[in-house]
């Protein structure tokens, strides 16, 4: 989801935005800081063993609107938050995993109907 009531259509920023990156640092990042024309993000998702993993970084403007929308994916617990209001704003994002549905207990992460 987007923070601070941003509109859904991404608009070009006049200046570069710096974001904290963790587990998601591109080659052009320095000291765990990446640069973007789009958004900073923090995401939490379950790995294959069901352990919550937090990643953060930069999303380019192209496609970021879709990525920040946080559409539910079947059989995948994941949540993402995006921000642009200041540099390293994603330090203050704390997305939480959506609650487990009953169906998820039955299916497990690898069984598909």
């Amino acid at each position: 989801k987007k923070e601070d009531g941003e509109s859904t259509a991404p608009t070009a920023r006049p200046k570069v935005l710096r974001c904290k990156c963790h587990h998601h640092c591109p080659e052009d990042s320095v000291n765990n800081i990446c640069s973007t024309d789009g958004y900073c993000f923090t995401m939490i998702e379950e790995d294959d063993s069901g352990t919550p993993v937090v990643t953060s970084g930069c999303l380019g403007l192209e496609g970021s609107d879709f990525q920040c929308r946080d559409t539910p994916i079947p059989h995948q617990r994941r949540s993402i938050e995006c921000c642009t209001e200041r540099n390293e704003c994603n330090k203050d994002l704390h997305p939480t995993l959506p609650p487990l549905k009953d169906r998820d207990f039955v299916d497990g992460p690898i069984h598909h109907k």
Epitope: P14, K15, R18, D28, V30, T36, C58, G60
Partner: antibody, heavy 116, light 112 residues
């Protein structure tokens, strides 16, 4: 029109500090970063660092950490660079510049001479 | 740090001739957003640099169309199709993909 005004030459003694200014006009000051660049004769251009006036966020070239300190006063749309413990190596022209994703406008530069 | 190597260091040309300046970077300048932040500036004697070309090939406002930029990855070129007297000065390439941002050492365009 976009302008970055820098004062005339500065003459300082070795060991002293100096605070260079850069007054921006013709655009929204907080919408762009301000960068500082050093130019010594025959030594090309050297990026010192940059500051985002909207949140005072700074990035420095490692070579200038401890030497340069960047600040802004948004009420007067002015950026500052303080240089400390000056030596003859710091004698140069110092430019401020507006930066979005690239530098599009430069100040006219302030010539700093460090000499006893 | 990314090293920007410009050639030639000096370029003597006749007025009306074409001039070409090369800039090579020690690593790719393609940013993770897909943009390539390679730019060209002209510095005339006693003046501050002026932006000519941004992001490889985009002419800045007011820059004559005799200036053009091209290239990709690590290899870039600035071309002036017909050199005029007002084009004389030192040309710099610059990258803003990697921190710290770096500049080429400059190419001095002078009259032959």
């Amino acid at each position: 029109q976009v302008q970055l005004q820098q004062p005339g030459p500065e003459f300082v003694k070795p060991g002293a500090s100096v605070k260079l200014s850069c007054k921006a006009s013709g655009y929204t000051f907080t919408s762009y970063w301000v960068q500082w660049v050093k130019q010594r004769p025959g030594q090309g251009l050297e990026w010192i660092g940059e500051i985002d006036p909207s949140d005072n966020y700074t990035l420095y070239n490692q070579n200038f950490k401890g030497k340069a300190t960047l600040t802004v006063d948004t009420s007067s749309s002015t950026a500052y660079m303080q240089l400390s413990s000056l030596t003859s190596e710091d004698s140069a022209v110092y430019y401020c510049a507006r930066f979005g994703f690239y530098v599009d406008y430069w100040g006219q530069g302030t010539t700093l001479t460090v000499s006893s | 740090d990314v090293v920007m190597t410009q050639t030639p260091l000096s370029l003597p040309v006749s007025l009306g001739e074409q001039a070409s300046i090369s800039c090579r970077s020690s690593q790719s300048l393609v940013h993770s957003t897909g943009n390539t932040y390679l730019h060209w500036y002209l510095q005339k004697p006693g003046q501050s640099p002026k932006l000519l070309i941004y992001k490889v090939s985009n002419r800045f406002s007011g820059v004559p169309d005799r200036f053009s930029g091209s290239g990709s990855g690590t290899d870039f070129t600035l071309k002036i199709s017909r050199v005029e007297a007002e084009d004389l000065g030192v040309y710099f390439c610059s990258q803003s993909t990697h921190v710290p941002f770096t500049f080429g050492s400059g190419t001095k365009l002078e009259i032959k």
